[in-house]
Amino acid sequence: EVEKTACPSGKKAREIDESLIFYKKWELEACVDAALLATQMDRVNAIPFTYEQLDVLKHKLDELYPQGYPESVIQHLGYLFLKMSPEDIRKWNVTSLETLKALLEVNKGHEMSPQVATLIDRFVKGRGQLDKDTLDTLTAFYPGYLCSLSPEELSSVPPSSIWAVRPQDLDTCDPRQLDVLYPKARLAFQNMNGSEYFVKIQSFLGGAPTEDLKALSQQNVSMDLATFMKLRTDAVLPLTVAEVQKLLGPHVEGLKAEERHRPVRDWILRQRQDDLDTLGLGLQG
């Protein structure tokens, strides 16, 4: 009987192909050369290996690259990526956006796993900042990605990257995150004309200070109530009734439906009743 550590005669793998699915785990371990596996990683995904067999292949790569896999291997990991732990991924140096896309594709349709989060973190740190192409890629796979970053992490986003941000990418951002993103957006869109500027800046206005809201009120922007409801309370409170009326334009009537909700309630409470009455909406301070 052949020892389990020795490859049976005639079973030594010459290439990574479908015949390997019939190998027992110990045979894969004994008969597949790690260097061969590394050079033919792109073939692994076309072969229906079991999870147990994939564990063996991962083990072989781990032995070959104890300090972490090279990017040439990482790019072709495919479903083997799902076998990686965050600790494995922390050893990697991923610099190619194509590699990142290939691995994100494997996890597509699922929530962001700890493995993916670690991969993205390694990639972004390696680049030094969250550039536009990276942000484009990440938000395409994970629309909530931007809002998963801490305010400190968001501070490394250059204003030029803001062009890649879509309104839905900001849906789950909290006020502290918008406080960081708004000044970057203001800078990014500063050369646009009034109406175009408002369309772009609108989804970032949850971080806008009072002075900017006052300025917008002079530009006939007709802010919708959904945007107004996301404004910072401290930015809304100093606005006069006349300024809010100008800011909202025809949408001012929507205040009535939101009078019990913040920040509308906070604002109403601090206005003179005579001023509120000029709106003709029956708002009670």
Partner: antibody
């Protein structure tokens, strides 16, 4: 710094009116950014918000208690008060007054006063 | 009224454990959610406001996250003084409501 102190009878008879006062020290009840709330907690149970008042006199009450509650403010005494009418044993609780800061929430609380409704 | 549902209602944990408490609102409340800690016989204490902002003087092991309807309070490494009852509270709607509370007990 701002401190709150509840005062009032610890025992009230059923069907009578519960009256409590909260005295604000180290700050002003006329603060632009603050509302002043009453919150209660029956023994062994969770917290229930009763209502709030702004220094202007504007009030807002818990819908389930609205018909029985009156909250008032006396800016000259730096106090606000709670009146709860037609009390029953179900109103037995620790009653807290609290500052509701517009930016942070209930950031300052009184130490609470136990009110028992019993004949 | 907006209902606030906390889970679990109680949990047992050891010093050093990572503890997570969740709070769900019956409708969207944006980020208008606060977390409080209450110890027996004491008034509640504000820990987190606006869903994720740490109140002054509160240890950094406490953190909050979430927006819309789902929120989380996390204690990264439980300390002996953290055994208490925790409440979430929404201030989005004018009728403020609290969650039912989560009692954190010693295992």
């Amino acid at each position: 710094q701002v401190q709150l102190q509840e005062s009032g009878p610890g025992l009230v008879k059923p069907s009578e009116t519960l009256s409590l006062t909260c005295t604000v020290s180290g700050g002003s009840v006329s603060s632009y950014h603050d509302l002043w709330s009453w919150i209660r907690q029956p023994p062994g149970k969770g917290l229930e918000w009763i209502g709030y008042i702004y220094y202007s006199g504007s009030t807002n009450y818990n819908p389930s208690l609205k018909s029985r509650v009156t909250i008032s403010v006396d800016t000259s005494k730096n106090q606000f008060s709670l009146k709860l009418s037609s009390v029953t044993a179900a109103d037995t609780a620790v009653y807290y007054c609290a500052r509701d800061n517009v930016f942070t929430g209930f950031d300052i609380w009184g130490q609470g006063t136990m009110v028992t409704v019993s004949s | 009224d907006i209902q606030m549902t906390q889970s679990p209602s109680s949990l047992s944990a050891s010093v050093g454990d990572r503890v997570t408490i969740t709070c769900r609102a019956s409708q969207s409340i944006s980020s208008y959610l606060n977390w409080y800690q209450q110890k027996p016989g004491k008034a509640p204490k504000l820990l987190i406001y606006a869903a994720s902002s740490l109140q002054s003087g509160v240890p950094s092991r406490f953190s909050g996250s979430g927006s819309g309807t789902d929120f989380t309070l996390t204690i990264s490494s439980l300390q002996p003084e953290d055994f208490a009852t925790y409440y979430c509270q929404q201030s989005y709607d004018a009728s403020y409501t609290f969650g039912g509370g989560t009692k954190v007990e010693i295992k």
